[in-house]
Interface confidence: low
């Protein structure tokens, strides 16, 4: 967990003396953009608990890792939620403090409640100033539950939350109806993401067994230790008045940590410092109790005495939480005889030891070949052993040789030697070799001679367009295989470099020299052919085409359709940018025009062979629609259509075309010609009995005109299935005019 503590000074007689301090023990914390991480942020969070506006609070930075908030003018300024944010990147963490007004109607028996997933949480609001009205419970500012004022038990209103889940976490409040929100009891509920004693994705991992009231973090399994305790399992007490993950911080003032509330990263929450309790953390622990909020009992054995800050102080020859364990000589366990690391890495080396007294972090050390002694940065304490973890400074070749792990306790000492081999990551001496190239891919042989140590575990190929500032694309390949760089741009130069890796952390070597490889752009050789075309209107033409079926990927980026109007000497070009397309609708053409049409495949800027041309005559603009079309059933197989001629005709009508379709049918409509243009009625025969039909019609002069309105009519019943609709004249052949 991030080493971040939010301290609240609870000497509340004068709000102007109240302050909040956020302290980070992280390296480089709070220095902002000129150092490693973003600055510490300390602010009041008004999203849930809003207070009347007052003068702005003052933020003061004290050194690189501390920030303090002052300038509270009245008690109501203090009420609510404060947060401190620290740590960088994925470790960025928010610590929250909830402040209750000491004069509120309702006060929380306990502000912070940390519970496990699936537990029942009980929030208890104690009546401080009674009102005979209902109590409203809220969760994160939203209404949650109402309790009748008669439901107080023992002067307390209880909210029971069974089977809590992580989304139940947040700020809860209990408020008398129609009372000021500042008189509420505010609580913080923290629900760990796992059941008791478990952590990790799926909660499959077992917590280390945090001591002294430490809480197991559900994401990383580390113990978040109460203020005044340290160690992997919070097994060690700090000296009185100290806090922080390594006991590196000191409480301000002569009375130590009295009157201070400590808030730590979730899932710990807030508590008094070690040795103190009470709503304002001003009461010392009762005899036999110790730790944060005095929650722990000493129960010392074998003559041990209880210290309210650290617990049992054991006489010589005894150790353990209750002085229950006797001492014996320590021993180093299962140390590997040889370890291998890569140059310039900062590995972690573990050394495990057992003994009585139990070896602690400071009692295990690591000695390098040059005599430098390293102290462990972390220790994992288990029932049968302590494992010290050493963060080794950046390795150099001179670090190769024999290292030694040594453990010393009052029970004696032990040591083990082991060999460390420092290996040099491989660096390519030559550029990769181009084997074959296509328009959108390059086949590359990546394995080249190299300096440094093998074996080669992975080969990374980095590539990007020449002279580009964009990020490099990277492909990881098997050392023994050639690499195909795909989805490249045709006719483009690519800078390609190899990076080799050997096994282990930091095994990636420097990038090798670059080489320039250029993709091809072969001429498209496929000749399309025009499958068909049909006129969809006087200025619209639907064209479809095909390509020969050839094996392998299609060499092409799209199609170019060309329309040549010989009369006007004009060429129209239509780009179809998908090589998968096989049809296009050409619009905005000139009615009554003779066009020559062809299609060709293109690739980059190269055009393939054109299709054999087609000759298309667009009809001139057609006449207006016939008027007042009407349908009347005559029998079970005949319907009569009547209409009026179009108005304002540009010339004599050559024929009418009737469209017949079964209502709701999915098939293509049938077109029937009426070859006597002077007629204003026709009978459609051969229809099915008891069937609804749709009809519309248009006139033709040199070209087809606009459609009339659609009319609907049903044939009469009791007829036989007919062959299909006919009219005295022949069926029209309008359609594919190829």
């Amino acid at each position: 967990a991030v080493d971040l503590t939010l301290l609240a000074n609870l000497r509340l007689t004068d709000p102007q003396r109240f302050f909040l301090t956020c302290v980070s023990g992280e390296a480089g914390a709070g220095r902002g953009s000129d150092a490693w991480g973003p600055p510490l942020l300390l602010e009041k969070d008004d999203r849930i608990v809003r207070t009347p506006p007052g003068p702005p609070l003052r933020l003061a930075r004290n050194g690189s890792h501390q920030v303090t908030l002052r300038g509270f003018s009245k008690p109501s300024d203090l009420v609510g939620v404060f947060s401190c944010v620290g740590g960088a990147g994925a470790r960025r963490t928010r610590v929250i403090y909830v402040h209750n007004s000491p004069g509120a109607h309702l006060l929380p028996d306990k502000v912070t409640h940390t519970v496990n997933k699936g537990d029942t949480a009980v929030l208890s609001a104690r009546v401080h100033k009674e009102k005979q009205t209902d109590v409203i419970w809220k969760s994160n500012g939203s209404y949650f539950y109402t309790l009748d004022w008669h439901e107080a038990q023992d002067g307390r209103f209880l909210l029971q939350l069974p089977n809590v889940q992580p989304p139940s976490s947040g700020i809860y409040s209990a408020t008398y109806l129609e009372a000021s929100p500042l008189g509420s009891a505010f609580f913080r509920l923290i629900v760990r993401g796992c059941g008791a004693g478990r952590w990790g994705p799926g909660c499959t991992k077992e917590c280390p067994g945090c001591l002294h009231g430490g809480v197991c973090h559900d994401h990383d399994g580390e113990c978040v230790c109460p203020p005044g305790f340290t160690g992997t399992r919070c097994e060690q007490a700090c000296r009185e008045g100290r806090f922080g993950q390594s006991c590196q911080e000191q409480c301000p003032g002569i009375s130590g940590c009295r009157g201070l509330t400590f808030c730590l990263p979730d899932p710990y929450g807030c508590s008094c410092g070690s040795g103190w309790r009470g709503s304002q953390c001003q009461e010392a622990c009762a005899p036999g109790h110790f730790g944060a909020d005095c929650r722990l009992q000493c129960q010392c054995q074998n003559g041990g005495t209880c210290d309210r800050f650290s617990g049992c102080v054991c006489p010589s020859g005894w150790h353990g939480v209750h002085c229950e364990k006797s001492d014996r000589i320590p021993q180093i366990l299962n140390m590997a005889s040889e370890l291998e690391f890569n140059l310039e890495t900062m590995p972690r080396i573990n050394c495990a030891a057992a003994g009585n007294p139990f070896p602690v972090r400071g009692s295990i050390e690591l000695r390098k070949p040059d005599g430098t002694v390293l102290l462990s940065t972390k220790a994992i304490v288990e029932p049968e052993k302590t494992t010290a973890e050493f963060e080794v400074p950046r390795l150099v070749l001179a670090d190769s040789g024999f290292w030694e792990c040594r453990v010393s306790t009052s029970g004696g000492q032990d040591s083990r030697r082991f060999k460390v081999n420092v290996k040099v990551p491989p660096v390519p001496l030559a550029a990769p070799r181009l084997l074959t190239k296509q328009s959108r891919q390059l086949v590359v042989s990546p394995l080249v001679s190299f300096s440094g140590d093998g074996p080669i575990s992975t080969v990374r190929l980095h590539y990007r367009p020449q002279d580009s500032t964009m990020d490099w694309s990277t492909i990881v390949v098997d050392p023994s295989e050639n690499v195909t760089l795909m989805n490249l741009r045709p006719k483009t130069g690519y800078s390609v470099r190899v990076q080799l890796s050997r096994p282990g952390e930091g095994g990636e070597g420097a990038w090798g020299p670059p080489t320039l490889m250029t993709t091809d752009c072969p001429e498209p050789l496929l000749q399309p052919w025009l499958e068909g075309w049909h006129v969809e209107g006087t200025d619209r033409l639907r064209v479809s085409w095909s390509l020969p079926l050839v094996p392998g990927p299609l060499v092409g980026d799209g199609f170019l359709l060309r329309l040549w109007d010989g009369t006007r000497g004009q060429e129209r070009r239509e780009n179809v940018s998908s090589p998968q397309a096989r049809t296009a609708l050409l619009t905005g053409l000139t009615p009554g025009t003779h066009y020559q049409l062809d299609v060709q495949l293109y690739h980059c800027t190269l055009l393939g062979p054109a299709s054999p041309p087609a000759h298309v005559l667009l009809p001139p603009s057609g006449p207006p629609a016939p008027r007042h079309l009407h349908a009347q059933a005559l029998s079970d197989s005949e319907i009569q259509l009547t209409w009026k001629h179009p108005e304002a005709l540009p010339g004599p009508i050559s024929k009418y075309v009737v469209e017949v379709q079964v209502a709701g049918g999915a098939g293509d409509p049938l077109w029937i010609d009426v070859d006597r243009p002077e007629e204003t009625s026709t009978i459609i025969r051969g229809l099915n009995a008891s069937t609804r039909y749709l009809f519309r019609m248009r006139a033709s002069i040199q070209g087809l005109g606009d459609w009339s309105n659609t009319v609907e009519e049903s044939t009469l019943g009791n007829g036989l299935q007919a062959e299909g609709p006919v009219q005295e004249s022949r069926a029209a052949e309008e359609g594919l005019d190829q």
Epitope: L526, S546, P548, L549, V550, G552, P609
Partner: antibody
């Protein structure tokens, strides 16, 4: 019905020439890629040559390159294979084949014509 | 050119049995692979194209699988008319090549 019908096979001496024809019917010949495939007696199939619809692009197996020429006459719906410098190992049944609907594989075959190269 | 290798050369099975024929390409042909059946005295007949698509009219006891370099033709229950020679063919390059064939005979 889609049909391919080969002709022009026969007996020829080593070093001689022969021209095979394949008449297509039942489909739009000019839109399809055409191939020749052969099968020596008791042996497996061997792809020989291919030609694309316009006739502008041809491919050959290494074993016949420089000796055989594939061509087509789209107006006559006919595919040809001109075989020069014939060798004994060219003895085989020669099939013409094309792709109608199988996205690249040969789903239409002729019945084959026998070519025997022997002295 | 891409070489195609079929195995086994001969496969002896009884009617009703399951047949598995293999074909390996010397380099990747993606899924551009076809299987043909040739009965004695007859022209080849397309069974499978695109490695796994059945050609028109082919019974569903024939199935193909694989991509890249390794392919399989499976006949789930052999019928008497299935005993023939089977060829694989790649068309992933413009120079097509066939395998040497697998003869499926009655045991």
């Amino acid at each position: 019905e889609v049909q391919l019908l080969e002709s022009g096979g026969g007996l020829v001496q080593p070093g001689g020439s022969l021209r095979l024809s394949c008449a297509a019917s039942g489909f739009t010949f000019s839109q399809y890629v055409m191939r020749w495939v052969r099968q020596a007696p008791g042996k497996g199939l061997e792809w020989v040559s291919g030609i694309y619809p316009s006739g502008g692009w041809t491919t050959y197996a290494d074993s016949v390159k420089g000796r055989f020429t594939i061509s087509r006459d789209n107006s006559k719906n006919t595919l040809y294979l001109q075989m020069n410098s014939l060798r004994a190992e060219d003895t085989a049944v020669y099939y013409c084949a094309t792709v109608a609907a199988a996205a690249g594989a040969f789903d239409i075959w002729g019945q084959g014509t026998m070519v025997t190269v022997s002295s | 050119d891409i070489q195609m290798t079929q195995s086994p050369a001969t496969l002896s099975l009884s009617p009703g049995a399951r047949a598995t024929l293999s074909c390996r390409a010397s380099q990747s042909v993606s899924s551009y692979l076809a299987w043909y059946q040739q009965r004695p005295g007859q022209t080849p007949r397309l069974l499978i194209y695109g490695a796994s698509s059945r050609a028109t009219g082919i019974p569903d006891r024939f199935s193909g699988s694989g991509s890249g370099t390794d392919f399989t033709l499976t006949i789930s229950r052999l019928e008497p008319e299935d005993f023939a020679v089977y060829y694989c063919q790649q068309y992933g390059s413009s120079r097509h090549t066939f395998g040497q064939g697998t003869k499926l005979e009655i045991k």
